[in-house]
């Protein structure tokens, strides 16, 4: 298909950074200022993205590639290609419709973005809490209570005996 297209389409060989100009008998013309074409054979150039307001320019637009934006300090990118900027919060907070709010008791957030998540429930793994959680940090689980009981041994248990009638491999 690609070979057929290139034989039929007089525009197929205009290089990136140009467009096939129908107003000039389909010769290749450079992309105008503030536009780009990242692939060859284009009939139009795309308008460069402008990084305004809370967005700032991470990479300038060129004739062959679009501008890339990131967010000004105090904000972070969301979405493909940083399509949105969202306000940062402090660690121990999450962003709500009313702004940054502290994590509720029993939850934490160790980043400037995202939501507060519940502390790990150590008992589900049969472990005990070694270090308590805070708004900024998860709990640290320690060994299970049984591991700490008197007489508990750290000696490795013996290997299970082979079934009768089986010779060593």
């Amino acid at each position: 298909f690609e070979r057929t297209r290139s034989l039929q389409d007089p525009c197929s060989n205009c290089p990136a950074g140009t467009f096939c100009d129908n107003n000039r008998n389909q010769i290749c013309s450079p992309c105008p200022p503030n536009s780009f074409s990242s692939a060859g054979g284009q009939r139009t150039c795309d308008i460069c993205r402008q990084c305004k307001g809370v967005f700032r320019t991470r990479k300038e637009c060129s004739s062959t590639s679009n501008a890339e934006c990131d967010c000004t300090p105090g904000f972070h990118c969301l979405g493909a290609g940083c399509s949105m900027c969202e306000q940062d919060c402090k660690q121990g907070q999450e962003l709500t419709k009313k702004g940054c709010k502290d994590c509720c008791f029993g939850t934490f957030n160790d980043q400037k973005r995202g939501i507060c998540r519940p502390w790990t429930n150590c008992s589900l793994d049969g472990k005990s809490v070694l270090v308590n959680g805070t708004k900024e940090r998860d709990v640290v689980c320690g060994p299970s209570p049984a591991d700490l009981s008197p007489g508990a041994s750290s000696v490795t248990p013996p290997a299970p005996a082979r079934e009768p009638g089986h010779s060593p491999q």
């Epitope: 290139s6 034989l7 389409d9 007089p10 525009c11 197929s12 060989n13 205009c14 290089p15 950074g17 140009t18 096939c20 000039r24 008998n25 389909q26 010769i27 290749c28 013309s29 450079p30 054979g41």
Partner: nanobody
Amino acid sequence: EVQLLESGGGEVQPGGSLRLSCAASGFSFSINAMGWYRQAPGKRREFVAAIESGRNTVYAESVKGRFTISRDNAKNTVYLQMSSLRAEDTAVYYCGLLKGNRVVSPSVAYWGQGTLVTVKP
């Protein structure tokens, strides 16, 4: 406005050489393919050679090994070096600006006025 101005034609003996030039203006020369065509008296215009922006070249079978197409993007000029000329090379030679930077199955967007090459003993 696109302008193509050929020069370098003239009368030459068989086996001789000539270099044709085509000075281009009014468009972005370096990103477009250029070609040379010729029209002998009483015949249809035919493809001779073409060169794309990346300097890939294509030649008609009848001129392969004898003619060389080249370009100077700094001077916006395309050249046709012709050697081992024969009587059958007699024609008006036209410079063409090719559509879409294509040298395979090329089609011409703009023509020059032509320059006459005559090969005779």
